[in-house]
């Protein structure tokens, strides 16, 4: 799998999960979150050559089409596969609220 | 939805499903399919700006990150959402076989 275990410990050029830290205030303009101040969101990047973690029959077809038609604008794209939630704390008045923000962290990628 | 109904009848520049015809022999090197000779596979293309059919909380966060950090390499990507099967005919000896190839046709796209 193109997950953090593999991708963070390799110099993989093809589609893989990459490290990205997001600061809530600076990068999103989110000022309501008390903790954490930011988080490791990660992102997916890299080309999707034929037979590289292709998601569906269609993405296999498209990658093969690309091999036969170099320079075509139709190509699979490296996108998140497994996403994880992020627990956050914010305040309403003086009362802390703990929430899980779903689908916030990329753990692995795929070619779709 | 960024489907064929909307995308094929508009000049949408953002993420949308685009027309693509694939010839099995010429474009894929598949010589085993008797009918059809090719099919309208379609593909997804176009930028994924903020508030544009974003798939998950993560893709919204990433698009917002992009707005606060222009030129960042981390950005959502336009990929297939709804896929449909394609019925094909091929021969085993002189005997025709009809099969459904699943996930072969793109009907709509999303930003992931």
């Amino acid at each position: 799998a193109l997950d953090t275990n593999y991708c963070f410990s390799s110099t993989e050029k093809n589609c893989c999960v990459r490290q990205l830290y997001i600061d809530f205030r600076k990068d999103l303009g989110w000022k309501w979150i008390h903790e954490p101040k930011g988080y490791h969101a990660n992102f997916c990047l890299g080309p999707c050559p034929y037979i590289w973690s292709l998601d569906t029959q269609y993405s296999k077809v498209l990658a093969l089409y690309n091999q036969h038609n170099p320079g075509a604008s139709a190509a699979p794209c490296c996108v998140p596969q497994a996403l994880e939630p992020l627990p956050i704390v914010y305040y309403v008045g003086r009362k802390p609220k703990v929430e899980q923000l779903s689908n916030m962290i990329v753990r692995s990628c795929k070619c779709s | 939805a960024l489907d064929t109904n909307y995308c094929f009848s508009s000049t949408e520049k953002n993420c949308c499903v685009r027309q693509l015809y694939i010839d099995f022999r010429k474009d894929l090197g598949w010589k085993w399919i008797h009918e059809p000779k090719g099919y309208h596979a379609n593909f997804c293309l176009g930028p994924c700006p903020y508030i544009w059919s974003l798939d998950t909380q993560y893709s919204k966060v990433l698009a917002l990150y992009n707005q606060h950090n222009p030129g960042a390499s981390a950005a959502p990507c336009c990929v297939p959402q709804a896929l449909e099967p394609l019925p094909i005919v091929y021969y085993v000896g002189r005997k025709p076989k009809v099969e459904q190839l699943s996930n072969m046709i793109v009907r709509s796209c999303k930003c992931s």
Partner: antibody, heavy 122, light 108 residues
């Protein structure tokens, strides 16, 4: 494309109730909070509250608590806002508006309905 | 309850720059959103989370937010920009969403 279509104009007498509907299309109804905002003639925007279409949970502005009820019918992707004990100063255009993010209290509204005029007059 | 103060009106000549302010106690510590409302129409989101711009909103629209004032800036103003503009924040004390009183932008 993504849109919110609201019910038609209403004329009500003081003390009565009004129920405005907001039908969503082009997106997953349960994936976004729905807010209600009103605007009296010649006045500014006033937030009334939100409903989580997924759970039915609500959060009403302090000013409207006890008078407003927000509900939804997920089978027809429709949100409702009912305001009771109407007064003449409730005369306003009532808008439904989609919250863009999920579980983000400081969120904004990316899609708005066309508005429903409610007139309260004896 | 948190109060947002906007000037009732701002006038600007075509092609010039319009600046609409939104004042609030320590507003720089809050996320600000801006809406444009043309006569007889529903509001439209023009700036999100201080300075993000939804697709379809021209680059002429920008915003900033620090200390006690948030500002919406419209460069090279056009006749079509004539509208009411509202700022909005979340009041964490009351858990309410709060709008400013609105500013009517007139293009001379």
């Amino acid at each position: 494309q993504v849109q919110l279509v609201q019910s038609g104009a209403e004329v009500k007498k003081p003390g009565a109730s009004v129920k405005v509907s907001c039908k969503a299309s082009g997106y997953t109804f349960t994936g976004y909070y729905m807010h209600w905002v009103r605007q009296a003639p010649g006045q500014g925007l006033e937030w009334m509250g939100w409903i989580n279409p997924n759970t039915g949970g609500t959060n009403y502005a302090q000013k409207f608590q006890g008078r407003v009820t927000m509900t939804r019918d997920t089978s027809i992707s429709t949100a409702y806002m009912e305001l009771s004990r109407l007064r003449s100063d409730d005369t306003a255009v009532y808008y439904c508006a989609r919250s863009f993010l999920w579980l983000v209290p400081s969120d904004a509204f990316d899609i708005w309905g066309q508005g429903t005029m409610v007139t309260v007059s004896s | 309850s948190y109060v947002l103060t906007q000037p009732p009106s701002v006038s600007v000549a075509p092609g010039k720059t319009a600046r609409i302010t939104c004042g609030g106690n320590n507003i720089g510590f809050r996320s600000v959103h801006w809406y444009q409302q043309k006569s007889g129409q529903a509001p439209v989101l023009v700036i999100y989370f201080d300075r993000a711009r939804p697709s379809g909103i021209p680059e002429r629209f920008s915003a900033s937010n620090s200390e006690n004032t948030a500002t919406l800036t419209i460069r090279r103003v056009e006749a079509g920009d004539e509208a009411d503009y509202y700022c909005q924040v979340w009041d964490s004390d009351s858990d309410d969403l709060v709008f400013g009183g609105g500013t009517q932008l007139t293009v001379l």
